[in-house]
């Protein structure tokens, strides 16, 4: 069975292809190659006569073809127009014809693609962006890469136009890229330069730093405002509703209690047209903005009811504070047997009764802060010797 084989089957434009012939009969008059799936004199490429060993070009001969004595046909510098079927007609020495048809496909050496975009400055959550991979070429596979990764599965990503167009629906600030497209065919592949998106967004709700609320008189007040935004936000400050300045930083030296108030940062994005504000309360005071945790001590933690007394002491290093006491979540004193002294630092119970057993704690506070001690457990016994085992935090 006469057959032909293309080497290679997929040919790069400008390269060469050899149409090999297998099972060529021994006794031959001649043979001829034709462009197409059948013998057609109008599409004859070349004929070869065994007797004269001469090749005769046909009407479809381009000058790039070479026929060999083994009937193989070499086509050099192929073009995409050469793609298709080729038929070999063999005339045996008995003048009986045999035919075989083969084919090959010519693909272009692909150029470096480029990405065009219908919107290079989209607005977050509002605009869609369509990327198109150029150029459009036949028999080409289009692939897309985001951040050097193949496309993730996302309802916001749509491929169309034979995967040549990538559409991002409702872009977000995380869609900046980079984006690359790759074109492939069976003989070559090429990737574009990366393209990044300039996604316009924000401003988000501003953050004022530092987070401190309390300042002492005489300190410097330095506040900074930041809101995520593209392009960067324009900032302005208001104090108690009154405009101060259009800067990202607000600096007030040597503050006084009069500088206490509400500080508003206003962030504006002129491209998106959006505005966001954040309000921060600043308190200027001599008082400690943070009251340290007080310590609680008991003269005894296990006492004999109706006989012993006990003193509980609440200790703190803070000044300008007040102290209050709690027993079983109730404020004290709750009976005539309980007395507070030394600015409420000491709670005396005399005599101790059964109902006084339980958990006690103290709380120190000033107008702007407070803190509680750890609880202490008072045990009340009857007809038993008291145990002197010191503090027993609960």
């Amino acid at each position: 069975q006469l057959t032909t084989e293309s080497m290679p089957f997929n040919v790069a434009e400008g390269k060469e292809v050899l149409l090999l012939v297998h099972n060529l009969p021994q006794q031959l008059f001649g043979y001829s190659w034709y462009k197409g799936e059948r013998v057609d004199g109008n599409r004859q490429i070349v004929g070869y006569a065994i007797g004269t060993q001469q090749a005769t070009p046909g009407p479809a001969n381009s000058g790039r073809e070479t026929i060999y004595p083994n009937a193989s046909l070499l086509i050099q510098n192929v073009t995409q127009n050469d793609t298709g079927f080729y038929t070999l007609q063999v005339i045996k020495s008995d003048l009986v014809n045999e035919e075989a048809t083969g084919q090959f496909h010519v693909y272009p050496e692909l150029p470096k693609p480029s990405i065009s975009s219908n919107n290079s400055n989209p607005v977050e959550d509002k605009d869609a962006v369509a990327f198109t991979c150029e150029p459009e070429t036949q028999d080409t596979t289009y692939l897309w890469w985001i951040n050097n990764q193949s496309l993730p599965v996302s309802p916001r990503l749509q491929l169309s136009n034979g995967n040549r167009t990538l559409t991002l629906l409702s872009v977000t600030r995380n869609d900046t890229g980079p984006y690359e497209c790759e074109i492939q065919n069976p003989v070559s592949a090429n990737r574009s330069d990366p393209v990044t998106l300039n996604v316009t967004y924000g401003p988000d709700t501003p953050t004022i730093s530092p987070s401190d609320t309390y300042y002492r008189p005489g300190a410097n007040l330095s506040l900074s405002c930041y809101a995520a935004s593209n392009p960067p936000a324009q900032y302005s400050w208001l104090i108690n509703g009154t405009f101060q300045q259009s800067t990202q930083e607000l600096f007030i030296p040597n503050i006084t209690v009069n500088n206490s108030g509400s500080y508003t940062c206003h962030a504006n994005n002129s491209v998106t047209g959006c505005n966001r504000t954040t309000v921060k309360t600043i308190i200027v005071t001599e008082l400690s903005p943070v009251v340290a945790k007080p310590q609680i001590k008991a003269s005894k933690t296990t006492v004999t009811g109706d006989k012993d007394s006990v003193n509980l002491t609440c200790s703190t290093n803070d000044t300008g504070i007040s102290i209050r006491w709690f027993f079983k979540n109730q404020s004290l004193p709750s009976s005539e047997r309980m007395k507070l002294s030394q600015g409420n630092t000491t709670l005396s119970i005399n005599p101790v009764k059964r109902e006084d057993a339980g958990t006690y704690w103290c709380e120190v506070f000033n107008p702007i802060s407070k803190n509680q001690s750890d609880p202490i457990m008072l045990n009340v016994n009857y007809n038993a010797l008291p145990q002197e085992n010191g503090l027993s935090p609960g």
Epitope: G41, Q44, G47, A49, G51, T52, T56, P57, P59, L95
Partner: antibody, heavy 124, light 111 residues
Framework: EVQLLESGGGLVQPGGSLRLSCAAS????????MSWARQAPGKGLEWVST????????YYADSVKGRFTISRDNSKNTLYLQINSLRAEDTAVYYC?????????????????WGQGTLVTVSS | QSALTQPASVSGSPGQSITISCTGT?????????VSWYQQHPGKAPKLMIY???NRPSGVSNRFSGSKSDNTASLTISGLQAEDEADYYC???????????FGIGTKVTVL
């Protein structure tokens, strides 16, 4: 199966004209040259004319040159012979034959198939 | 262009071998290896028997063979059979202008 069927022969007066046709089938018509040969009654074969597969090249025996015209219509797989200025010595059976030339060059190729012939009689 | 020279007749008994000659010049038979032989039964169309001096087409018996020496080509029929009785014509390519010439023909008779 290769078949060649001639037609158009008949009785014609000297100086007259005829157009012979040959309908071909069973092979790729336009890759082969086609020929006409003739045989006068009781005489031998005489080559008359050959045309290349494309129809671009034509060849004639000296005895008919200028009077006979060979042509072909590849779309109809048909060969023609226009005979003008007929003489008594042109009386013969005219055979259509596949071959003479092969492909588009001038590669000689035998007359491997023949039609049954059509009789042309030139007489007053 | 003169017709090629052939013997007017050749005869032989069944089973015998006969040879028909075809003589031309160096411009035809001697100049090319394009000699063909045709068989023609009475009232029938010619049939190709040998081409390019010695090649047999499909369907032709191997009892028919051809050869050439200088300006003379030959057709040999071996094992002569009754159905071989016919007229035989040689033909040669001449040139690229006047392509072909036939022989005058030989009548083969099987005795």
């Amino acid at each position: 199966e290769v078949q060649l069927l001639e037609s158009g022969g008949g009785l014609v007066q000297p100086g007259g004209s005829l157009r012979l046709s040959c309908a071909a089938s069973g092979f790729t018509f336009n890759t082969y040259g086609m020929s006409w040969a003739r045989q006068a009654p009781g005489k031998g074969l005489e080559w008359v004319s050959t045309i290349s597969g494309s129809g671009d090249n034509t060849y004639y025996a000296d005895s008919v040159k200028g009077r006979f015209t060979i042509s072909r219509d590849n779309s109809k797989n048909t060969l023609y012979l226009q005979i003008n200025s007929l003489r008594a010595e042109d009386t013969a059976v005219y055979y259509c034959a596949k071959g003479g030339l092969l492909w588009f060059g001038e590669l000689p190729y035998p007359f491997d198939y023949w039609g049954q012939g059509t009789l042309v009689t030139v007489s007053s | 262009q003169s017709a090629l020279t052939q013997p007017a007749s050749v005869s032989g008994s069944p089973g015998q071998s006969i040879t028909i000659s075809c003589t031309g010049t160096s411009s035809d038979v001697g100049g090319y290896n394009y000699v063909s032989w045709y068989q023609q039964h009475p009232g029938k169309a010619p049939k190709l028997m040998i081409y390019d001096v010695s090649n047999r087409p499909s369907g032709v018996s191997n009892r028919f063979s051809g050869s050439k020496s200088d300006n003379t080509a030959s057709l040999t029929i071996s094992g002569l059979q009754a159905e071989d009785e016919a007229d035989y014509y040689c033909s040669s390519y001449i040139s690229t202008s006047t392509l072909y010439v036939f022989g005058i023909g030989t009548k083969v008779t099987v005795l």
